[in-house]
């Protein structure tokens, strides 16, 4: 587990505690909440980040804004169970023994049930659509400049391989970023699109997860790109299993943020 050896910190995750007692006497950074050692040369998994967020002292926790709600009764913030590799366990349960199945980004994909509910496998979210609306500007951004800047952001800040940024669409003031990553495409060491999307989501909200780095300062040809609304859609390799009544209202999971 690599980290800045000189002062033993985790550049990619400020929700950690680091000490020089890792294998070989190296710096080891543990995620708050789970205590799992994280690899500070890459993004931390969303599951461990959510767990860390929920374990933070009450007075230090970022409160959920009233406007931050998840449609399809997607319970937004919760204290998840993560597997030994830090991924979401397919079945999540709360303290009152209510259980549900989630996808690889931790979004509920079934109706809620009891402890007898079975979730046979962790279903992969292979397509993420990030829908942004930017604040009014003097004129529209140049599409190719915007495309290049957002691709650069995902490549450099989140270390996401460029091939996983499928497209950037723009119809002022709406920007859509499409991330695609099938199970077969994701190689060992590749950043997961779900983790990249979560870091981006937190950056957009001014809650950067990076240690000591300034907040996200998005600019296109020097012009600030200020986001006033974010909507994130998650599409799974296997369609979700909600009751028919529910499916007539919603066709896919989405988060809504202001």
């Amino acid at each position: 587990h690599t980290a800045a050896q000189d002062n033993c910190t985790c550049p990619t995750n400020k929700m950690t505690v680091c000490s020089p007692d890792g294998p070989g006497g190296r710096c080891q950074c543990r995620a708050l909440g789970s205590g799992m050692a994280v690899d500070c040369s890459t993004l931390t998994s969303k599951c461990l980040l959510l767990k860390a967020r929920m374990s933070a002292p009450k007075n230090a926790r970022t409160l959920v804004r009233p406007s931050e709600h998840a449609l399809v009764d997607n319970d937004g913030l919760y204290d998840p169970d993560c597997d030994p590799e830090g991924r979401f366990k397919a079945r999540q349960c709360n303290q009152t023994s209510v259980c549900w199945c989630v996808n690889s980004v931790g979004v509920r994909r079934t109706d809620k049930g009891d402890l007898s509910l079975r979730c046979d496998e962790l279903v992969r979210t292979h397509h993420i659509l990030i829908d942004l609306r930017h604040r009014p500007t003097a004129g529209a951004f140049n599409h190719s400049d915007l495309d290049a800047e957002l691709r650069r952001l995902f490549r450099e800040r989140y270390r996401l391989h460029p091939k996983f940024v499928a497209a950037v669409h723009y119809e002022q003031p709406t920007i859509q970023i499409e991330l695609r990553q099938n199970t077969s495409q994701k190689a060992a060491g590749d950043v997961d699109i779900g983790d990249a999307a979560y870091y981006f989501e937190r950056d957009i909200k001014g809650e950067s997860l990076f240690q000591g780095r300034g907040g996200l300062d998005l600019r296109v040809r020097g012009e600030p790109l200020q986001v006033e609304r974010t909507l994130i859609y998650y599409l799974d390799e296997i369609p979700p299993k909600f009751s028919m009544k529910r499916l007539t209202h919603h066709h896919h999971h989405h988060h809504h943020h202001h």
Partner: antibody, heavy 115, light 107 residues
């Protein structure tokens, strides 16, 4: 050389509280986790929790979360554990240990809970 | 929580023999396992960290191996002072836990 020196033995009545100290020397106190472990007579080792002295971030074994409090005083490189509402089955030797692999241990503090 | 199961509970051997102690984790913990020796009335002493890393001051007859869920502490040739209780402990995630111990006794 690295040393962890604990406070002396304690005898307490059920329902009382006890506070055990662990004074560290020979290394940078703030950079290594301090763990608390106990061992009941004739039994194995049981992890109570850990504290990171730099920022006092503490993690508790669920079993002790309601009764144990770990603190530290950086100015004197000392960690503390307080256990409240003592019961007879809290009778044990309490150890502090350093780092994730417990490379150095205190000599142990015997806590006896008896009416 | 991660459960560590040590076997055997008691191992009876003679000085000069080879001792093999086992520790099994209830889930994959990589190499985040550490081994301790404890003698009556004393504090535990670290023998091996991260499954196979040696510790300064610990005799070379003590070695460790394994990863994932199965781990082994080996004492190549037992000395009289090696008869004690041995514990494994994991540091993969919180809560840390210990195995129940293996008592190594003189045959």
């Amino acid at each position: 050389q690295v040393q962890l020196v604990q406070s002396g033995a304690e005898v307490k009545k059920p329902g009382a509280s006890v506070k055990v100290s662990c004074k560290a020397s020979g290394y940078s106190f703030t950079t290594h986790w301090i763990h608390w472990v106990r061992q009941a007579p004739g039994q194995g080792l049981e992890w109570i929790g850990t504290i990171f002295p730099s920022n006092a971030y503490a993690v508790y074994n669920q079993k002790f979360r309601d009764r144990a409090t770990m603190t530290r005083d950086r100015s004197i490189s000392t960690a503390y554990i307080e256990l409240s509402r003592l019961r007879s089955d809290d009778t044990a030797v309490y150890y502090c240990a350093r780092a994730s692999y417990f490379d150095y241990w205190g000599q142990g503090t015997t806590v006896t809970v008896s009416s | 929580e991660i459960v560590l199961t040590q076997s055997p509970a008691t191992l009876s051997l003679s000085p000069g023999e080879r001792a093999t102690l086992s520790c099994r984790a209830s889930q994959n913990i990589g190499t985040s396992i550490h081994w301790f020796q404890q003698k009556p009335g004393g504090s535990p002493r670290l023998l091996i960290k991260y499954a196979s890393e040696s510790i300064s001051g610990i005799p070379s007859r003590f070695s460790g191996s394994g990863s994932g869920t199965d781990f082994t502490l080996t004492i190549s040739s037992l000395e009289p002072e090696d008869f004690a209780v041995y514990y494994c402990q994991h540091s993969h995630s919180w809560p840390f836990t210990f195995g129940q111990g293996t008592k190594l006794e003189i045959k």
